[in-house]
């Protein structure tokens, strides 16, 4: 099991990268002047207490920024939020902190991130681009839920 967060670069199948804008993550086309965030991911150390067939449960943070991705309800709808949080503090908790956990599933080069707190809801970007990352139940329609991960060392 990993005990240090792994830095990764994430882009979607349309080659859009994640950028932090006013404390919101948005997906924009990769260009010269765009500086994408580096994502840190670390596996939950209580993997045996989570569902086994949905993927690898991970925490997702913004490298060096003490911000982590989490899911919370806004009204009836789960939403994707950034919270000020040290990813290692989440990792070390005595129980899985489900609101901050995602099942990371890989199929070939494509990765999906499903909320542990809200099964069936996936991190997504609108097909239009320049839009905030969201959670969606609609797979492969107006939203892109497939991402490519590149490990950074």
């Amino acid at each position: 099991k990993s005990e240090m967060p792994q830095p990764v670069s994430i882009q979607d199948i349309n080659h859009r990268v994640w950028v932090l804008q006013d404390q919101i993550l948005i997906a924009v086309p990769r260009k010269d002047r765009v500086s994408p965030v580096t994502i840190s991911l670390i596996s939950c150390r209580h993997v045996e207490t989570l569902e086994k067939d949905r993927g690898n449960p991970i925490y997702l943070g913004l490298n060096g920024l003490n911000l982590c991705l989490m899911c919370a309800k806004a009204g009836d709808q789960p939403t994707l939020q950034l919270k000020e949080k040290d990813i290692m503090d989440l990792y070390n908790q005595p129980e899985p902190v489900k609101s901050f956990l995602f099942y990371h599933s890989q199929s070939g080069r494509n990765s999906t991130f499903e909320s542990v707190a809200f099964p069936g809801w996936f991190i997504a970007v609108s097909s239009e681009g320049g839009c905030p990352l969201i959670l969606t139940q609609e797979l492969g329609k107006a939203n892109t839920t497939d991402f490519g991960l590149t490990m950074l060392f």
Epitope: H46, E48, T49, L50, P94, E95, S99
Partner: antibody, heavy 121, light 109 residues
């Protein structure tokens, strides 16, 4: 408001089994962890185990592995503790508690009123 | 298995300060033990006070604080009130299981 209401006192004979219920209101048990703890007469608290009602996974103190079984019925928002092969040493008050993450830590924020289980021949 | 030990009883004057401690048989208590403190008042439900060693649970008065002190988990009550008379239990995490202490009966006299 948030409440955990447990079933009533039980008197059992040695070797028998007992099932204690813990009905939650004011929140969905699938959104948290339910812990079970016991207190024998004149003793401190003992952790029995916990269940994640959303997926049914459990953890037990080694001492209670095989003795206690934790389950939930999410349709009725109820958690259960079943104890088998009862002995006089199992006489205790059994508590359920919510163990919830808020802000930056997990807390035991709400407790049931306790269920006295007496094992006597 | 680890044994967690607390003072059986302590007395504090109203308005005074008292520190309850929680010792581990396995050595120094650290933040990795994620100490929890709960309170039991006669005839009332248990109440969670502290989680994660030093984080006060929502709604808990500021006079209660958690810390590490000399290799033990500690609960300090500053400005004790008569209503703080109760039993206090600590619980420490050891990897994937939790161990409670025997409790401290606190008298406010």
């Amino acid at each position: 408001q948030v409440q955990l209401v447990q079933s009533g006192a039980e008197v059992k004979k040695p070797g028998a089994s007992v099932k204690v219920s813990c009905k939650a209101s004011g929140f969905n048990i699938k959104d948290t962890y339910i812990y079970w703890v016991r207190q024998a007469p004149g003793q401190g608290l003992e952790w029995i185990g916990r269940i994640d009602p959303a997926i049914g996974t459990t953890r037990y103190d080694p001492k209670f592995q095989g003795k206690a079984t934790l389950t939930t019925d999410t349709s009725t928002n109820t958690a259960y503790l079943e104890l088998s092969s009862l002995r006089s040493e199992d006489t205790a008050v059994y508590y359920c508690a919510r163990y919830d993450y808020s802000g930056s830590s997990f807390y035991f924020d709400y407790w049931g009123q306790g269920t006295l289980v007496t094992v006597s021949s | 298995q680890a044994v967690v030990t607390q003072e059986p009883s302590l007395t504090v004057s109203p308005g005074g300060t008292v520190t309850l401690t929680c010792r581990s048989s396995t050595g120094a208590v650290t933040t990795s033990n994620y100490a929890n403190w709960v309170q039991e008042k006669p005839g009332q439900l248990f109440t969670g006070l502290i989680g994660g060693t030093n984080d006060r649970a929502p709604g808990v008065p500021a006079r209660f604080s958690g810390s590490l002190l000399g290799g033990k988990a500690a609960l300090t009550l500053s400005g004790a009130q008569p209503e703080d008379e109760a039993d206090y239990f600590c619980a420490l995490w050891y990897s994937n299981h939790l161990v409670f202490g025997g409790g401290t009966k606190l008298t406010v006299l």
